[in-house]
Amino acid sequence: KAMHVAQPAVVLANSRGTASFVCEYASPGKATEVRVTVLRQADSQVTEVCAATYMMGNELTFLDDSICTGTSSGNQVNLTIQGLRAMDTGLYICKVELMYPPPYYMGIGNGTQIYVIDPEPCPDSD
């Protein structure tokens, strides 16, 4: 079977353009090295948002310029995406790969629809 990956169906970004969700996977084995990738699907186009490889029990490390941060706990990854704007609304898909030890496993979640609403500009005060 494909490795099952679960994530919430819908998340609303906060007023600062930050959205968080949990990506949970059912590990068929005892993985020590895991890679998590967040993909955005919109109009059948798929782009990579961010990715991190981590050792079980350690922190996720994203690239310095990544808009993502995250923590792991067992088979759960808590992901946060920052700097989102209304145009970034879309389906954010969690892809999990068990890199080591063999055999390799991979699973893809059904996606979290993230809605982003740009805040209204503050009216000028006299």
Epitope: A2, L39, Q41, K95, N110, G111
Partner: nanobody, 126 residues
Framework: EVQLVESGGGLVQPGGSLRLSCAAS????????IGWFRQAPGKEREMVSC????????KYADSVKGRFTISRDNSKNTVYLQMNSLRAEDTAVYYC???????????????????WGQGTRVTVSS
Amino acid sequence: EVQLVESGGGLVQPGGSLRLSCAASGFSSDYYDIGWFRQAPGKEREMVSCIRSSGGSTKYADSVKGRFTISRDNSKNTVYLQMNSLRAEDTAVYYCGLAPISPVHAVCNQHYFGYWGQGTRVTVSS
């Protein structure tokens, strides 16, 4: 453990034909994308053609449209690539790939592939 075993590669003259086969095992889901990718020396791996297991949606690279045909035999868990009117630029190592997707995922998107065969070499030369 997912295994993809390719066969059918070889040396062929320009204008000739080859039929590649990919036998998949260790994957019991009835929903997935499976397809052919190729990598020429010094180049990135590119999708050649792909087919969805359920419904049979297909996708072809512009460079092979009208010359290559992908098909599948679900009873044998095998996918075929019939390659006609071969050209020198088709020379590459051809890989079979599998994406453990669901209906929400865009058809045959390279980001969703994670399982790969060892590859079979195709050489088009006179």
